[in-house]
């Protein structure tokens, strides 16, 4: 059926009309209230505030950052936490409250000129001349996910696999790209016969993990050519 085709992990030669998705756990958007909840209605209030799941710092409020609530906690479960004040320990700029930044593991006050210089230097090193519109003062929008974040967890949007945490790769999911788990031994994988021969895959799988390769599963040799199952196997 169309739905079972849609739900296969790697869809090739996309038959219209597939695709399009929204939402995943731990990453509802913390947009400015005026965007999702305009007009000053009650949805803007935080009466019933509860820990808010996130995948990136930018999804949290200006005075929050995204992290696991417990030290050494489950990396997959992250919530928006209150920003850290001056002289508190930090690992990245986004952890520090507005007007501060992370230097040598401590939140310090931003001497604006100095702070801006440090940011631009970091960007230039990592991303070439990608700072033409940088405003060193608007911390939350300019220190975007590509810079001061911890690596993306499963489900985080990414541009390349280096954006993702260890054990994850950056792969297509619907029309976007997210961090997905690198495949383990015995897991189904996608084998492309030739580069460019596979059509549109809107649900890409990651590659097989270290020491594994994507090969035809032994008991599927007899199956028809089109339905042969490939799995990650030891070299």
């Amino acid at each position: 059926t169309l739905n079972s085709v849609l739900n296969s992990n790697a869809i090739k030669n996309l038959p219209p009309p597939l695709g399009g998705a929204a939402g995943h756990p731990g990453s509802a958007v913390s947009a400015a209230p005026g965007i999702l909840y305009p007009g000053g209605n009650k949805y803007q209030t935080i009466d019933n505030y509860q820990p808010y799941p996130c995948a990136e710092d930018e999804e949290c409020g200006t005075d929050e950052y995204c992290a696991s609530p417990t030290r050494g906690g489950d990396a997959g479960v992250q919530i928006c936490l209150a920003c850290r004040k001056r002289r508190k320990r930090c690992m990245r700029h986004a952890m520090c409250c507005p007007g501060n930044y992370c230097k040598n593991g401590i939140c310090v006050s931003s001497d604006q000129n100095n702070f801006r210089g440090e940011i631009e230097e970091t960007i230039t090193e990592s991303f070439g001349n990608d700072h033409s519109t940088l405003d060193g003062y608007s911390r939350r929008t300019t220190l975007s996910s590509k810079m001061y974040h911890s690596k993306g967890q499963e489900g985080s949007v990414c541009l390349r696999s280096s954006d993702c945490a260890t054990g994850l790769c950056c792969a297509r999911h619907f029309w976007s790209k997210i961090c997905k788990p690198v495949l383990k031994e015995g897991q189904v994988c996608t084998k492309h016969r030739r580069k460019g021969s596979h059509g549109l895959e809107i649900f890409q799988r990651c590659y097989c993990g270290e020491g594994l390769s994507c090969r035809i599963q032994k008991d599927h040799h007899q199956a028809s050519n089109s339905s042969r199952l490939h799995t990650c196997q030891r070299h």
Partner: antibody, heavy 114, light 112 residues
């Protein structure tokens, strides 16, 4: 802040063209698939088009196929909808929408009238 | 296209009383990634959609906890435990597992 802001709407005569823009800010725009959705006055929402994160793949609703073109400029964090051969039935508020962590803009009104 | 059918189409509720809206999809919205791509949103006149619930049961940031979503596969429900005056408007369900994204016809909620 994380937001989408549409612009380019207005009053246009049938058969003419219009280009809508959607400026994204506060998130990694180039990693997300982006959609256009519209709402005719007093009606429900209708999905219009999608473009993949890299701009390589596009898909359209039958009602706009061949007339509308979705595109994006990741360097400018901007999504576009080029609307040609406009008809009265294209009159609607047009919203750009981000998938996965769903986010919509405030919308821009397009009125097609002679 | 996946057809989304909402019931009832209109609901008149006394403040403080509960309200419940049903949404049925023409096919399962469960993806093999384990997620079910069903949303609920509220729309007020002249305003864009205000998203309330994502993936069946997860509340968006700063949505009051009187809103809750439940269901699986093809049958879904939005519940408001105690309706307040500002909850009036049209509630829609939406699926995004398959293009085109499709929407319920809407349920108009008004205060008695």
């Amino acid at each position: 802040q994380v937001q989408l802001v549409e612009s380019g709407g207005g009053v246009v005569q049938p058969g003419r063209s219009l280009r809508l823009s959607c400026a994204a800010s506060g998130f990694t725009f180039s990693g997300y698939g982006m959609h256009w959705v519209r709402q005719a006055p007093g009606k429900g929402l209708e999905w219009v088009a999608v473009i993949s994160y890299d701009g390589n793949d596009k898909y359209y609703a039958d009602s706009v196929k061949g007339r509308f073109t979705i595109s994006r400029d990741n360097a400018k964090n901007t999504l576009y909808l080029q609307m040609n051969s406009l008809r009265a039935e294209d009159t609607a508020v047009y919203y750009c929408a981000r998938e996965l962590r769903v986010l919509w803009g405030q919308g821009t009104l397009v009125t097609v009238s002679s | 296209d996946i057809v989304m059918t909402q019931t009832p189409l209109s609901l008149s509720v006394t403040p403080g009383q509960p309200a419940s809206i049903s949404c049925k999809s023409g096919q399962s919205l469960l993806h093999n990634d384990g997620k079910t791509y069903l949303y609920w949103y509220l729309q007020k006149p002249g305003q864009p959609p205000q998203f309330l619930i994502y993936e069946v049961s997860n509340r968006f940031s700063r949505v009051p906890d009187r809103f809750s979503g439940s269901g699986s596969g093809t049958d879904f429900t939005l519940k408001i435990s105690r309706v307040e005056a500002e909850d009036v408007g049209i509630y829609y369900c939406m699926q995004s597992i398959q293009l085109p994204w499709t929407f319920g016809q809407g349920t108009q909620v008004e205060i008695k």
